[in-house]
Amino acid sequence: FGDEEERRCDPIRISMCQNLGYNVTKMPNLVGHELQTDAELQLTTFTPLIQYGCSSQLQFFLCSVYVPMCTEKINIPIGPCGGMCLSVKRRCEPVLKEFGFAWPESLNCSKFPPQNDHNHMCMEGPGDEEVPLPHKTPIQPGEE
């Protein structure tokens, strides 16, 4: 790895994906963006859902798709595990439907490895919160 080749991993420059437990990525991401600026633009459209608070894992999950983890040790980006995807989807899909939208095809959970192992590396993410969802209405002015 001491060769003068192109650096394999790049620092994450997307503010909402910093301080999530890993700090480097490599584009293209898992939905095909070549640039972090383009990934950030798409990520921002999920802000209402993140603010709604349907899943504490949502932000980590989205970041793992749009800026997957990179390590100098292996040549492929490490995205989310299918289990985390399903957990987030279970909690957030009903909220998306309230907004009038379906779960995005780009976040289809079958695209991701079911679990992290030597053959298919993926991120399990922070622990899932198995508590009842509080009843929330779509975000009103002034709500944080």
Partner: antibody
Framework: EVQLVESGGGLVQPGGSLRLSCAAS????????MHWVRQAPGKGLEWVAS????????YYADSVKGRFTISADTSKNTAYLQMNSLRAEDTAVYYC???????????WGQGTLVTVSS | DIQMTQSPSSLSASVGDRVTITCRAS??????VAWYQQKPGKAPKLLIY???SLYSGVPSRFSGSRSGTDFTLTISSLQPEDFATYYC????????????FGQGTKVEIK
């Protein structure tokens, strides 16, 4: 209920200025892209400008860059379009719209007519 | 800049007809394309987003599809309330932020 209400349209002379307002209710504009889209009489839709106040992003169509300014007052939950150096070709109905997931503009206001004429 | 060329500009059809409207992107784009319906004096209404996803509350006779740089809106069986103007819209994906609409297709009664 989500609602967008535009105001501020009217008759203005070429070279003049006008400020349009888009009052939003039922959601927090901070977390959504807010857009201005216009439609000249008998013509199609033309995107004018967008703002994402949560991150302070603003974007403009080339045809209005340097003349129009989009802004938002999140405490009033209102988006604005300041239009300067108006031209006859800016005559149109101006719509305010919001978008989030997949960029789709899911809610639109009723529109406000801007007429630039001497 | 990406251009969205919409065709036809107008068409005449009867109730019950199958209607197809196409938008061609001038270069490769993502599936971030939406379709809107607009009636005279009214604001546009969202029908389809992400090229093929039906927006909530929109009748299932409306559908969207993609083939390469061609995006298609299909109305499987035209209803009286469907006579209107339809617009495609390309959303930002890469290479900067620029929203472009197609020129519109007016669907009239034959």
């Amino acid at each position: 209920e989500v609602q967008l209400v535009e105001s501020g349209g009217g008759l203005v002379q070429p070279g003049g200025s006008l400020r349009l307002s888009c009052a939003a209710s039922g959601f927090n504009i901070s977390y959504y892209y807010m857009h201005w889209v216009r439609q000249a009489p008998g013509k199609g839709l033309e995107w004018v400008a967008s703002i994402y106040s949560y991150y302070g992003y603003t974007y403009y169509a080339d045809s209005v860059k340097g003349r129009f300014t989009i802004s938002a007052d999140t405490s009033k939950n209102t988006a604005y379009l300041q239009m300067n150096s108006l031209r006859a070709e800016d005559t149109a109905v101006y719509y305010c719209a919001r978008s989030s997931f997949s960029w789709a503009m899911d809610y639109w206001g009723q529109g406000t007519l801007v007429t630039v004429s001497s | 800049d990406i251009q969205m060329t919409q065709s036809p500009s107008s068409l005449s059809a009867s109730v019950g007809d199958r209607v197809t409207i196409t938008c061609r992107a001038s270069q490769s784009v993502s599936s971030a394309v939406a379709w809107y319906q607009q009636k005279p004096g009214k604001a546009p209404k969202l029908l389809i987003y992400s090229a093929s996803s039906l927006y909530s509350g929109v009748p299932s006779r409306f559908s969207g599809s993609r083939s390469g740089t061609d995006f298609t809106l299909t109305i499987s069986s035209l209803q009286p309330e469907d006579f209107a103007t339809y617009y495609c819209q390309q959303h930002p994906w890469s290479g900067g932020y620029l929203i472009t609409f197609g020129q519109g297709t007016k669907v009239e009664i034959k």
